[in-house]
Amino acid sequence: EEELQVIQPDKSVSVAAGESAILHCTVTSLIPVGPIQWFRGAGPARELIYNQKEGHFPRVTTVSESTKRENMDFSISISNITPADAGTYYCVKFRKGSPDTEFKSGAGTELSVRAKPSAPVVSGPAARATPQHTVSFTCESHGFSPRDITLKWFKNGNELSDFQTNVDPVGESVSYSIHSTAKVVLTREDVHSQVICEVAHVTLQGDPLRGTANLSETIRVPPTLEVTQQPVRAENQVNVTCQVRKFYPQRLQLTWLENGNVSRTETASTVTENKDGTYNWMSWLLVNVSAHRDDVKLTCQVEHDGQPAVSKSHDLKVSAHPKEQGSNTAAENTGSNERNIYGGSG
């Protein structure tokens, strides 16, 4: 009888993660008596995957009827494949003895595992930035195999070109990770904008994965201020408004100053939203000019999103208005309905 040969017909097998891998092996003879074993890798550090003789291998099943001696098919199925299972598998015939001795090995079957990348996670800068500044976004995806992968960046559907991408590790590995950093120039219209990281991989069958970041989390559009004096509403009363326009985010505190002294502080509440996602707000001040002997410098001071305050002033001329006898400064008039300065917002 011819000497036993161990035949592994497949040089390589590719399996999607989570599926089962079938590794084929047949022998050409019933002798010598002794077990078949499967190993991953070669040499002294090889890992035992299945031993016909003994042991518990919950993920491994024999493909053929192993209770018949005439069976020469020692193919195995490994369930629930993960990237960690990748490697070269050897079917090895042993001769019975004490110890069992390796008689002949198959040529090996390389198992590669196709693993999907994780959903891309896009993260922006830790602090907000203002228009005209360049900010960096990172995109990460992990656990994919094989190594080949394509990553693209988009801003509102327009592909970006200023980015750098790395796939790690550089050498052979059971699975890989991708890390990319894109640079984006902010504009005032970016409150509604999105940055998208798109990952394409063989396992995704042409349906790429996307991760998004809203620029609303990143951008700060500082407000523009305009202080105007409205026509006199009543004798000796002037309405002064502070228009706070085109700001984002909404977090804003406004303080009125009268000749440098705090008159009133309020927080933006009933704002109006512009089409571009920025906000407008208006605060008004009703000034009783008869309470003032001299001109009044009214300042609208705005602190937006924790940034240093910006302000706009308006000089209110009182010389043209006749003064009431016995009148005092605004600070000295305390009558509840006789306030010299009234305020409101809208």
Epitope: V33, K96, S98
Partner: antibody
Framework: EVQLVESGGGLVQPGGSLRLSCAAS????????MHWVRQATGKGLEWVSA???????YYTGSVKGRFTISRENAKNSLYLQMNSLRASDTAVYYC????????????WGQGTMVTVSS | DIQMTQSPSSLSASVGDRVTITCRAS??????LAWFQQKPGKAPKSLIY???SLHSGVPSKFSGSGSGTDFTLTISSLQPEDFATYYC?????????FGQGTKLEIK
């Protein structure tokens, strides 16, 4: 059903011959190592002989040169030709199938009695 | 030849008992050790192979262990049908050899 049935036992005089047969059913006998095991009355088990799938044969020391194991694939049968029989060969002879990959005994026949006596 | 020594030669036990029979080989036999059960007037029945693997249909109350030269057969809870003679056997190399047997009797 996997089964082994021995036949051919009986009473024989010392120095005589006897041929034991074992008919296999439910499996292909030629694919397995096959064995003969004997047991003298009130004694333990003793392995006697084996034939491998390649036709290689093995014997215990006390029967070497006197016993011959063989098989006939067409009849799916195993044989033990016993010559120069001695009183010490008196025993029940069992036909046994070796296991799938390690030759561990798995299937036993019911046995046939061989008595060597004058 | 490899000698197989069983102990004890006989053993008395009661229904429900847990019993252990040992078998020692005169040299290393890896784990190519089998256990058989034989009742009077019957052919032996294969219980265990490769020291610890149960043959098909053998109840799990039978268990085997060991490797090298020292082996044990344990019956976890004796039932009336378990009273019989038990044999160990090495089958690592020819000539295959059996232990002398352990007769398990009802106390």
């Amino acid at each position: 059903e996997v089964q082994l049935v021995e036949s051919g036992g009986g009473l024989v005089q010392p120095g005589g011959s006897l041929r034991l047969s074992c008919a296999a059913s439910g499996f292909t006998l030629s694919s397995y190592d096959m064995h003969w095991v004997r047991q003298a009355t009130g004694k333990g088990l003793e392995w006697v002989s084996a034939i491998g799938t390649a036709g290689d044969t093995y014997y215990t020391g006390s029967v070497k040169g006197r016993f011959t194991i063989s098989r006939e694939n067409a009849k799916n049968s195993l044989y033990l030709q016993m010559n120069s029989l001695r009183a010490s060969d008196t025993a029940v002879y069992y036909c046994v199938r070796g296991g799938v990959w390690d030759d561990a005994f798995d299937i036993w026949g019911q046995g046939t009695m061989v008595t060597v006596s004058s | 030849d490899i000698q197989m020594t069983q102990s004890p030669s006989s053993l008395s036990a009661s229904v429900g008992d847990r019993v252990t029979i040992t078998c020692r080989a005169s040299q290393d036999i890896n784990n190519y050790l089998a256990w058989f059960q034989q009742k009077p007037g019957k052919a032996p029945k294969s219980l265990i192979y490769t020291a610890s693997s149960l043959h098909s249909g053998v109840p799990s109350k039978f268990s085997g262990s060991g490797s090298g030269t020292d082996f044990t057969l344990t019956i976890s809870s004796l039932q009336p049908e378990d009273f019989a003679t038990y044999y160990c056997q090495q089958y690592v190399s020819y000539p295959y050899t059996f232990g002398q047997g352990t007769k398990l009797e009802i106390k």
